[in-house]
């Protein structure tokens, strides 16, 4: 099935979803190692079988990742390689998703209740907005289909809503600074302690200085994952989640907290 989709000159949104599921064997939300090599192999074979040349995007992609064991791509990168239907592709190409900071601001706009989740209805509005910004309108049926597909693509814990880290897979891997924090997330108890101790003035939120101090310490402790030279970027991206410079517990938890225990 994936092979026949790869032979198409235009891949629909739902076909794209099936291709992704087929290759992302471990459900990690990324294609790396063997998964990525399988994709490249099958892509080349499918195009050959159909008597089709590799498109320039495909050629670049194969050149870039064909000989590498350490390659890693997300849904965004794949959407740029495959001849996906235009409106669906636009969701991955919009300005809001060009930088992590813009993405965080967009998230803040839609997670209005600071719950840390975007539910189906909010997601639909989010996608509608993205398309409108690209001067595209789609009918409600198509929008519902895209929303459903996005949920299927990104909702890795199947709870019917998207967390920030799930939604962030809309970002290109290189831009997704949240990946850097995956390995250093704290348990709920540790996170609450850190929040309390770095909130120097006890006003219940973290300001930019307090965040700066916290990030510097995290960089110091986690040199493998975080680079102290990128502190300005980390800070800018995280502060984009804030409300007028106030980073509340639930907001910072999206980045630094792994769970309850």
């Amino acid at each position: 099935m994936a092979e026949s989709h790869l032979q198409s000159s235009l891949i629909t949104a739902s076909q794209f979803f099936e291709i992704w599921l087929h290759f992302d064997a471990d459900g990690s939300g990324y294609l790396e190692g063997k998964e990525l090599q399988n994709l490249i192999q099958e892509l080349q074979q499918a195009r050959k079988k159909a008597g089709l040349e590799l498109s320039p995007e495909m050629k670049t992609f194969v050149d870039q990742y064909g000989q590498r064991d350490d390659g890693k791509i997300g849904i965004v990168e794949l959407a740029h390689v495959l001849p996906t239907e235009e409106n669906f592709l636009l969701l991955f190409r919009c300005q809001q998703l060009k930088s992590c900071e813009e993405f965080m601001k967009t998230w803040r706009k839609y997670d209005t209740d600071h719950s840390g989740f975007i539910e189906t209805e909010e997601l639909k509005n989010f996608l509608k907005d993205l398309l409108e910004k690209a001067n595209k309108t789609v009918d409600d049926t198509k929008l519902a289909e895209y929303t459903d597909l996005m949920l299927k693509l990104f909702d890795s814990n199947n709870d019917g809503k998207l967390e920030l880290t799930e939604m962030a897979r809309l970002l290109p891997v290189q831009e997704n600074f949240l990946l850097k924090f995956q390995g250093i997330k704290m348990c709920g108890k540790e996170f609450n302690k850190a929040f309390e101790l770095y909130d120097q003035d006890g006003n219940g939120y973290i300001d930019e200085n307090e965040l700066d101090a916290l990030l510097k310490d995290l960089c110091e402790k986690n040199k493998q994952d975080l680079d102290i030279n990128n502190i300005t970027t980390y800070k800018k991206n995280i502060m984009a989640l804030s409300d007028g410079g106030k980073l509340y517990r639930t907001d910072l938890a999206l980045i630094l907290c792994a769970g309850d225990n």
């Epitope: 101790l197 120097q200 006890g202 200085n209 700066d212 101090a213 510097k216 310490d217």
Partner: antibody, heavy 117, light 111 residues
């Protein structure tokens, strides 16, 4: 182990200004807050203000707003407090202290300021 | 501002006995499971020294005969057994909100 070395005793005239220094070592200056505190003879301690060394941002006890001005020089890991329009009331020992979290873990030895004509 | 009232102002204790110093805040200094009360020891000619932070945590290098307890508005510093070198003035301090304030101090004298 962190250390904080304060400048020597000062004898100044009323109305003048004075700049006290606090040179730090043994900890990451740029992710620390430096607080300044006042102690008059036979009295308790008073918190004046803090400065976040990473950005130079400050937070003052309202009582000392306009009287104290805090600055840092990150290249030398030194914090400063300028005290202006001095009166006899300002005669006291002034301490700098570091806080990374919400308690003062390293202290300077104190600088005695005497305001007298 | 939160006012901290320490008692007693002066405390004469015999060597080996227990010294108990109390600190009462004009409003709660506890939030989210943490109590922002700390204790310092101050000897003449020296800077204050952190003994206990967050109500009950012993600062590294401080002897285990010092202990702190309490939450909300009422806090206690205990020293047992008291030793000669413990003669000093002890201050409580809160960092619950700005401005941070200190108690009036308790002077511990060895009898």
């Amino acid at each position: 182990q962190g250390q904080m070395q304060q400048s020597g005793a000062e004898l100044v005239k009323p109305g003048a200004s004075v700049k006290l220094s606090c040179k730090t070592s043994g900890f990451t200056f740029s992710s620390s807050y430096i607080s300044w505190l006042k102690q008059k003879p036979g009295q308790s301690l008073e918190w004046i203000a803090w400065i976040y060394a990473g950005t130079g941002d400050t937070n003052y006890n309202q009582k000392f707003t306009g009287k104290a001005q805090l600055t840092v020089d990150t290249s030398s890991s030194t914090a400063y407090m300028q005290f202006s329009s001095l009166t006899a009331e300002d005669s006291a020992i002034y301490y700098c202290a570091r806080h990374k979290y919400r308690y003062l873990d390293y202290w300077g030895q104190g600088t005695t300021l005497t305001v007298s004509s | 501002d939160i006012v901290l009232t320490q008692s007693p102002a002066s405390l004469p204790v015999s060597l080996g006995q227990r010294a108990t110093i109390s600190c009462r805040a004009s409003k709660s200094v506890s939030t989210s499971g943490y109590s922002y009360m700390h204790w310092y020891q101050h000897k003449p000619g020296q800077p204050p020294k952190l003994l206990i932070y967050l109500a009950s945590n012993l600062e590294s290098g401080v002897p285990a005969r010092f202990s702190g307890s309490g939450s909300g508005t009422d806090f206690t510093l205990n020293i047992h057994p008291v030793e000669e070198e413990d003669a000093a003035t002890y201050y409580c301090q809160h960092t619950r909100e700005l401005p941070w304030t200190f108690g009036g101090g308790t002077k511990l004298e060895i009898k």
